[in-house]
Interface confidence: low
């Protein structure tokens, strides 16, 4: 058989026996030539090397370029190739010889003691156990122990090759300590050298790389990237790494075993790439890559290299920021830098420290945004090696729906004498303010919140028949009034305000607000009564520790059993969009008062008398009077407040002036407190007294002095008492000038 | 081979509890993830049980479902049912390609249908 | 946490020819996603993983490819099997347990 490319001027060298296989026995001689066109070298089984004492290579003596093997008596292990080559070219003859020993019809090894397979337990793979046999067509099987087991050859994956060995899947005898082949020729059995089985593993669960992502680095630094393997057991590893600049002087590489903890099913291989200096070209992709041989496993990072360090925002970072109150909002600083900035965050030029309601780091996160977050937000980014500062301001505005101011207060149900005029307001507050404050109505019977009626959460009415107010065909004459603008409590509210002309009819007003972000509604219930009538003796709020009574007074030939109840103490809460239930109609949350009964000639009139109100006895008082006739019950209900006692104080101060002869002097002082202080004022400690030239109005509270005179000058004191005490203020008031003489002196 | 059991309609609010049974496999060197499809709609990752019992959840399970297992077993406890839960519910065995934590899914259940309704 | 976007809800092709599906990450993550095939009343099941690797015992007309933020499964030599919605998702975990799992939203295949 020829071996290699026919060379142009080169024919093959030309063997004596031209077989490719050649049969002879054990103890005869082999004897084979070999003519070339240049020098020729012979290669033969068992000794690479050519330096095997037995075998004979000579010149031949006819011929140049002509070399003779020759074997005297040949033995089972000459078995194998024989090769005759050009040197230092790939051309070559080869035959392959049996030399049948039936005493040791297989080829022993370099090493005669025993051989070492290894395998790997992967179901798809298979191994050769390396029993080559001098005999090409023996019977042989595959003894394994232990636990002892034979394999005999099946067509098929298990299979005997003289010049190869035997084939058998791997997982077959990866139980197995050791393996031998066996052949039987007239009875007798013949065992070729021990095979040690060693399972090597090949699986490669994961190729991690650390650090795994975002690696930045400035020219000169270091760059060390670790590559993990984790592997089954015996496994061995090969590490390749591709980077983009291959010939970097700095480079070093350095592979090892990492220890597992003892009893672990898996192994550890680290390698390490370094290199000490990077320069731009080192930026690009970095790829480990391990390799068991059967498996490969890689794994990939980007590596970017700066010039130098720097710090800039990134072209995502908002300048707005738009929130609902309540919301969460999260403001990201955006920014390209080496190394990653300090990130620090100012509110109105004040730093921001992280609290639970409040996180100021690379992302400052407000958890529930409120009204009072609204402002300027400067974020200070400050690159750690060059101190290099960028800075950049966000404005978060923070929207709030519409809020009714008068749902906290609401009456579980007002009732309004019939015929009388009223006023119902919605007093909204919205950022930013409602662009429409809508009114409309139903009437009462329409929508009346029977207890047999289901509610639910979602359709919190049961009927939903809202009619604009401009329709008020049915119900009562209604005008809206232009939506004024007020400062309440230090808010710009909306307050929109409904005029039902004449109150005829009972119905269920609903104001709804809406803004950019959301809608808030306030529902009321104007429940018309012909019934008893409450009034307030005497007609206004008292103030705590005085005395107040409530008078329900009703006509005697239509109505009996007047009766005052309290509402509480705490009535039911009214959830948003829900209607205020009839009190007549709940009766349970209602506590029976004493009072007196007096009558006149056409009205009997129930008074209940409050000696020295208290906080306590503000809320909700309901008069309930029956239906001589029908027996039915008719509510009303009045709200009754209680001022809060205040001790005096003058609001803002009296200014020291100076003034010239003849000209006038106005100054006010203005005082509150419950009850109303009275005001009096003092010139150098002594009371003033009105005269010509000095006038107080509004209740003292404004004092003119007219053509101011010599001595008028001193120090003036306004001064507020009430039972809870007294307030003053001073002042200095010089009189410049000379006095003019006047006729009358 | 993986297979769900325990879907059935419930009212809103029901507690229920999914199962899925392995085979083939070992519970305690493989991760083990459910993942809901609704009708209609695409995947979504509930969450995932690791080798060595570890639990991960999305962040919109918020605590009403619970993740364990067994040696065969791995359970899905849902409370807090609503209508938006109604879905087909897929147990999958996770395959750890590169760290502990990431898995995709080489072996999925044929799903159990669960609908919540009233 | 990682959205993944499936830009085309559905795309047809006709028998034999080749059908080309994007899959796009809200950041970077390698090569860590794997795509499904999913036919009606069925379990998805594993076409490719770590982007590019094919999943065993499916066939070599279906490739992934991508690395980072942009990701493509192609299919060529479609045959009508190949009929179904397929899935993107990713197993990439930047620290936060809710990362892990994020698929996209599905791209119907139609066969013509």
């Known amino acids: 058989a020829s071996v290699g490319l026919p060379s142009v001027s080169l024919d093959l060298p030309r063997l004596s026996i031209q077989k490719d296989i050649l049969t002879i026995k054990a103890n005869t001689t082999l004897q084979i030539t070999c003519r070339g066109q240049r020098d020729l070298d012979w290669l033969w089984p068992n000794n690479q090397s050519g330096s095997e004492q037995r075998v004979e290579v000579t010149e031949c003596s006819d011929g140049l370029f002509c070399k003779t093997l020759t074997i005297p008596k040949v033995i089972g292990n000459d078995t194998g190739a024989y090769k005759c080559f050009y040197r230092e070219t790939d051309l070559a003859s080869v035959i392959y010889v049996y030399v049948q020993d039936y005493r040791s019809p297989f080829i022993a090894s370099v090493s005669d003691q025993h051989g070492v397979v290894y395998i790997t337990e992967n179901k798809n793979k298979t191994v050769v156990i390396p029993c080559l046999g001098s005999i090409s067509n023996l019977n042989v099987s595959l003894c394994a122990r232990y636990p002892e087991k034979r394999f005999v050859p099946d067509g098929n994956r298990i299979s005997w090759d003289s010049k190869k060995g035997f084939t058998i899947p791997s997982y077959m005898i990866s139980y197995a300590g050791m393996v031998f082949c066996e052949a039987k020729i007239n009875d007798e059995s013949y065992q070729s050298i021990m095979y040690i089985v060693v399972v090597v593993g090949y699986r490669i669960y994961d190729v991690v790389l650390s650090p795994s992502h975002g690696i930045e680095l400035s020219v000169g630094e270091k760059l060390v990237l670790n590559c993990t393997a984790r592997t089954e057991l015996n496994v061995g590893i090969d590490f390749n790494w591709e980077y983009p600049s291959s010939k970097h002087q700095h480079k070093k590489l350095v592979n090892r075993d990492l220890k597992t903890q003892s009893g672990s099913e898996m192994k550890k291989f680290l390698s390490t790439l370094t290199i000490d200096g990077v320069t731009r070209s080192d930026q690009g992709l970095y790829t480990c890559a391990a390799s068991s041989g059967l498996m490969t496993k890689k794994n990939s990072t980007f590596v970017r290299v700066h010039e130098k360090p720097f710090v800039a925002f990134g072209s995502g970072m908002e300048s707005l920021v738009e929130a609902t109150v309540g919301e969460r909002v999260r403001i990201p600083a955006k920014y390209l830098g080496y190394p990653p900035p300090e990130i620090k965050w100012y509110k109105n030029g004040i730093p921001l420290e992280s609290n639970h309601t409040i996180k100021a780091g690379h992302v400052l996160t407000i958890m529930e945004v409120s009204e009072r977050d609204t402002g300027n937000y400067t974020v200070i980014l400050t690159n750690p090696i060059s101190k290099e500062k960028q800075s950049h301001v966000v404005s978060l505005v923070v929207y709030v729906p519409p809020q009714i101011g008068e749902k906290s207060l609401i009456s579980p149900v007002d009732s309004y004498q019939y015929g009388t005029t009223q006023t119902l307001t919605c007093t909204v507050y919205a950022i930013p303010p409602p662009h429409h404050i809508h009114w409309y109505w139903q009437l009462e019977e329409e929508c009346a919140n029977e207890p047999s009626q289901a509610v639910s959460v979602t359709n919190p009415y049961p009927c939903e028949e809202w009619r604009s107010v401009e329709d008020f065909q049915g119900g009562n004459k209604i005008e809206v009034n232009k939506n004024q603008f007020a400062l309440i409590e230090g808010k710009n509210k909306t307050v929109s305000t409904l005029v039902i002309q004449a109150a005829n009819v009972s119905a269920l007003y609903k104001c709804e607000a809406v803004n950019k972000v959301g809608r808030g509604e306030r529902v009321i219930s104007f429940h018309v009564t012909r019934g008893p009538e409450i009034t307030l003796q005497p007609d206004m709020q008292p103030t705590e520790q005085e005395s107040v009574s409530l008078w329900c007074t009703a006509d005697r030939s239509t109505f009996e059993n007047l009766t005052w109840y309290k509402l509480g103490p705490q009535p039911l809460p009214i959830h948003v969009g829900e209607l205020p239930t009839p009190v007549c109609k709940n009766l349970d949350t209602l506590w029976k008062l004493n009072a007196t009964m007096f009558s006149n000639s056409t009205n009997d009139i129930l008074i209940m008398e409050l000696k020295n109100a208290s906080l306590q006895d503000q809320g909700d008082y309901v008069c309930l009077a029956q239906d001589r006739k029908t027996k039915k019950r008719h509510c009303v209900v009045r709200q009754l407040t209680v001022l809060e006692r205040v001790a005096p104080t003058i609001t803002g101060n009296l200014e020291n002036q100076t003034t010239s002869i003849g000209e006038s002097i106005e100054v006010s002082c203005t005082a509150s407190g419950n009850p109303p202080p009275q005001i009096m004022w003092f010139k150098d400690n002594e009371t003033l007294v009105e005269d010509s030239g000095i006038v107080l109005k509004d209740g003292n509270r404004n004092l003119t002095i007219r053509r101011v005179r010599k001595e008028d000058e001193g120090l003036y004191t306004c001064q507020a008492c009430s039972v809870l005490g007294c307030a003053k203020v001073e002042a200095f008031f010089i009189i410049e000038g000379a006095q003019e003489k006047t006729n009358l002196e | 081979s993986v297979e769900e059991s325990g879907g059935r309609l419930v009212t809103p609010g029901t507690p229920l509890t999914l199962t899925c049974t392995v085979s083939?496999?070992?519970?305690?060197?493989?991760?083990m993830s459910w993942v809901r499809q609704a009708p209609g709609e695409g995947l979504e990752w509930i969450g995932t049980i690791s080798s060595s019992g570890s639990t991960y959840y999305a962040t919109w399970v918020k605590g009403r479902f619970t993740i364990s297992k067994t040696s065969t077993t791995v359970d899905l406890k849902m409370t807090s049912l609503t209508a938006a839960d109604t879905a087909t519910y897929f147990c999958?065995?996770?395959?750890?390609?590169?760290?502990?934590?990431?898995?995709?899914?080489?072996?999925w259940g044929p799903g159990t249908l669960v609908t919540v309704s009233s | 946490a990682v959205v993944l976007t499936q830009t085309t809800s559905s795309v047809s092709a006709d028998v034999g020819g080749t059908v080309t599906i994007k899959c796009q990450a809200s950041e970077n993550i390698y090569s860590l996603l794997a795509w499904y095939q999913q036919k009606p009343g069925q379990p998805p099941k594993l076409l490719i993983y770590?982007?590019?690797d094919l999943a065993s015992g499916v066939p070599s007309r279906f490739s992934g490819s991508g690395f980072g933020t942009e990701f493509t499964l192609t299919i060529s030599d479609l045959e009508c099997a190949d009929a179904a919605t397929y899935h993107c998702q990713s197993y990439y975990y930047s620290g936060s347990s809710a990362d892990t799992g994020a698929f996209g939203g599905g791209t119907e295949v139609v066969v013509k």
């Open positions: 770590s982007a590019s």
């Open positions: 083939g496999f070992s519970l305690s060197s493989n991760a």
């Open positions: 999958a065995r996770g395959d750890d390609d590169v760290s502990d934590y990431f898995y995709y899914f080489p072996i």
